[in-house]
């Protein structure tokens, strides 16, 4: 008992932590003072009726990853205030409704990763009227979803079901929940997908399918009844798909009349782009989809890919596309020309070079594009990049951060409406007239700049942290500046006069510099009450670098002696 007690530490607010220890039971002596109890990653196997009896004010109980195989019927009977209960990854093979009946305040319940076959003989959750987040199921033994399983639940913020090995689904089991903001469904096989889809289409806003092999998925007509689909977003995460099954999936998506957003994360496309036009013409209508997001798409036979033109017509209404970290080195000109409504394109962490970008940003490409993100690609020349993008007449925001430009030419051409340019982490060591005068926001943080002397008459925000600047920029060159972030440079001081010269400045972040705490600097910073409103990282990040006896101390706390400040 005593060693158990020693593994638990509680603060004055009743937050008790005892995770990752060697507890083999819930420590004794817990009282009404305990508000939160984290005993995750221990060796607790048994919860008795008396363990938590006095914890009447307990709001959060985390027991994940223990070896719990038994919970006595009335173990939670006094936990009427409990809002958060995590019993995931234990050895509970039978779930009892009596555990949950007293938990009238429960908003979060996690039962994932326990070896039960079903969710019990009676409706487990019918008394949990405040429940918002529910996680159930496991990877191997949970094989059956029954009609009564979710009875009594009317609204859920999030429902996660690990039905990886599901073999039986009783129709209407999920239909009883009137509204689910986000349903996450883990299914290895697609066998019961359509049956579940029919039940959730009118109650789920965001549907996420995980870990599913859709290589052989075939869509067959659904009897969805008269209800309209509520699904606004469909996410496929770690899903396998082929050329053929992609079209089957698109037929399924056709059933969702209000679908606005489609997302593919960590998916594998086992195909070569062999999309049959006949199929396409007959069944595919992109509907209202405005946003397409693809992250870390793996195409094993990528270099065998050929004609994608059958997909082009599907893209004309899409407004936002993200294709991130998917080894994209070329967007075909014809595809770019078809993306007539595209306003936002994010191609971060790909393989684009200027010469192939030229093919993508051809004449009439992306006519509505306003934001282009090419962060961490293979761009190497600012001059070529700017020139390549001249075809994009409506482009206002460009992020080309994390490309290695090193140098900057004296002049560059850019689209004429440019307002935002991100050149952070591009290894540049100077800024020149290459930067467009039309900018309102410029980010050149994390580079090798030791000087900033550009006249940017319309600039409102300058992000220049993590460089080598020794002074604040000249305010007269930046007459409209509202925000200046210049932390972690080599600035040793700044004066009231300097700050006042930035007439429009509302926000300054200048912490993490090597401040020389002179008497002048200290009196200015400590006496100006209004300074704290402008300096958003004050006082924590403003430390003295010298004199040596105050090094590391916060500027606001340092007091120099009279003799130090009145030397003749």
């Amino acid at each position: 008992e005593s060693s158990n007690q020693a593994s638990l530490s509680c603060d004055r607010n009743g937050i008790c932590k005892g995770s990752s220890g060697s507890l083999n039971s819930i420590p004794s002596g817990l009282t009404e003072a305990v508000k939160s109890l984290d005993l995750s990653n221990n060796r607790i196997t048994y919860i008795s009726n008396s363990d938590l009896q006095r914890c009447v004010n307990l709001q959060a109980l985390v027991l994940t990853s223990n070896g719990i195989n038994t919970i006595e019927e009335d173990s939670f009977s006094s936990l009427g205030s409990l809002e958060h209960l995590d019993l995931s990854y234990n050895y509970l093979s039978n779930l009892s409704s009596s555990w949950f009946k007293p938990l009238s305040s429960l908003t979060f319940l996690n039962l994932l990763g326990n070896p039960y076959k079903t969710l019990g003989e009676t409706s487990l959750f019918s008394h949990l009227t405040k429940l918002q987040i529910l996680r159930v199921g496991n990877m191997d033994t949970f094989t059956k979803i029954q009609r009564k399983d979710f009875a009594g639940l009317t609204f859920l913020e999030e429902l996660e079901i690990d039905a990886s090995d599901l073999q039986s689904y009783e129709p209407k089991s999920l239909k009883s929940i009137q509204n689910v903001s986000h349903l996450i469904l883990h299914m290895k096989q697609h066998i019961l997908l359509l049956e579940i889809f029919v039940d959730v289409t009118s109650s789920v806003e965001c549907l996420e399918l995980r870990d599913t092999d859709l290589d052989t998925f075939h869509f067959s007509e659904l009897s969805t009844g008269e209800t309209n689909s509520l699904i606004k977003k469909f996410t496929f995460r770690n899903v396998k798909i082929t050329d053929e099954s992609l079209f089957q999936v698109m037929k399924l998506l056709n059933q969702i009349s209000g679908l606005l957003e489609l997302e593919f994360d960590d998916c594998t496309l086992n195909g070569v782009g062999n999309f049959r036009a006949s199929d396409n013409d007959r069944v595919i209508d992109p509907g209202k989809v405005e946003t397409l997001t693809i992250r870390r798409l793996h195409i094993p036979r990528f270099y065998l890919f050929y004609d994608l033109s059958t997909l082009y017509s599907l893209t004309e209404r899409v407004k936002r596309i993200t294709v991130e970290n998917s080894k994209v080195f070329l967007v075909p000109c014809l595809l770019s020309q078809h993306l007539k409504s595209l306003e936002y394109l994010d191609l971060s962490e790909n393989l684009m070079v200027e010469e192939y970008l030229k093919n993508s940003a051809c004449e009439d490409a992306w006519p509505s594009l306003q934001t282009l993100i090419l962060r961490q690609n293979h761009l190497a020349s600012l001059e070529k990049t700017g020139e390549t993008l001249l075809t994009l007449k409506n482009l206002t925001n460009i992020d080309i951060s994390k490309n290695s430009f090193h140098s900057m030419p004296e002049t560059c051409q850019w689209p004429e409406k440019m307002k935002y340019l991100n050149l952070s982490s591009t290894r540049i060591h100077s800024v020149t007239g290459c930067i467009p005068k039309t900018l309102e926001i410029l980010d050149v943080s994390n580079n090798n700049l030791n000087l900033f002397s550009l006249n940017l008459p319309q600039l409102k925000e300058l992000y220049i942290s993590r460089n080598k600047l020794m002074t604040l920029p000249d305010a007269s060159l930046l007459p409209m500046l509202l925000v200046l972030k210049i932390s972690r440079n080599a600035i040793t001081t700044f004066s009231k006069e300097q700050l006042d010269s930035f007439h429009t400045l509302k926000t300054l972040e200048a912490g993490g510099n090597n401040f020389i705490c002179s008497c002048e600097f200290l009196s200015f910073t400590q006496e100006q009450q209004a300074l704290a409103k402008v300096l958003i990282d004050w006082p924590a990040n403003y430390l003295c670098d010298s004199p040596s006896h105050v090094r590391g101390q916060q500027v606001q706390d340092v007091r120099l002696s009279v003799s130090e400040c009145h030397r003749t």
């Epitope: 065998l304 070329l330 393989l351 093919n359």
Partner: antibody
């Protein structure tokens, strides 16, 4: 300045294995692919395969699938190629090269000479 | 596999004149309007050096006397005017389909 520094020459016995290294500097290692190319004595160039350090994904020339294994250590920005069951046919200069734009090899290591002989 | 045939295997050229090396692919290396064909130069005892990528884009730092042209299956590398430093080996390479392949090489010689 971009650099790919390859390990020194190797003399190994037939049937043995050897691990060649390629240390990258002057660029963000995880942003680019690393390719390996073989050049036999007085011969042309033969593409072996690539590895992308960011996710460890590889692609091989079928002729080298059972011969070469590609790995990376991102903490030291180093790529490795291990060659197995060596024969005299494997005697060659092996180059590592940076893959840019998904299609071209813009920076090359100086090459490692491998001699397989008893 | 895509086979790349370079011709001629060796080319004798006078300094100051134009040298044209040809590379023919057994199938098209076109990829959505871009030809995925590269040219490399290799000096004795050194690694290859990229000259041209995407059939016609001159790599940064490569002298303007080097140019590339062609599309589909037929490509050429032009050097004009040829300098003494150019009298070495040249290879073409395709990256349209795996496995990537190189041409057999063309050796430039002084006439």
């Amino acid at each position: 300045q971009v650099q790919l520094q390859q390990s020194g020459p190797e003399l190994v016995n037939p049937g043995a294995s050897v691990k060649l290294s390629c240390k990258a500097s002057g660029f963000t290692f995880t942003t680019y692919g690393i390719n390996w190319v073989k050049q036999g004595p007085g011969q042309g160039l033969e593409w072996i395969g690539w590895i992308y350090p960011r996710d460890g994904s590889t692609n091989f020339n079928e002729n080298f699938k059972d011969k070469a294994a590609l790995t990376v250590d991102t903490s030291s920005s180093t790529a490795y190629m291990e060659l197995h069951s060596l024969t005299s046919e494997d005697s060659a200069v092996y180059f590592c090269a940076r893959l840019t734009g998904g299609t071209f090899l813009d920076w090359w290591g100086q090459g490692t000479t491998l001699t397989v002989s008893s | 596999d895509i086979v790349l045939t370079q011709s001629p295997a060796s080319l004798a050229v006078s300094l100051g004149q134009r040298a044209t090396i040809s590379c023919r692919a057994s199938e098209s290396v076109e990829y959505y309007g871009t030809s995925l064909m590269q040219w490399y130069q290799q000096k004795p005892g050194q690694p290859p050096k990229l000259l041209i990528f995407g059939a016609s884009n001159v790599e940064s730092g490569v002298p303007v006397r080097f140019s590339g042209s062609g599309s589909g299956t037929d490509f050429s590398l032009n050097i004009h005017p040829v300098e003494e430093d150019d009298i070495v080996m040249y290879f073409c390479q395709q990256s349209r389909k795996l496995p990537w392949t190189f041409g057999g090489g063309t050796k430039l010689e002084i006439k």
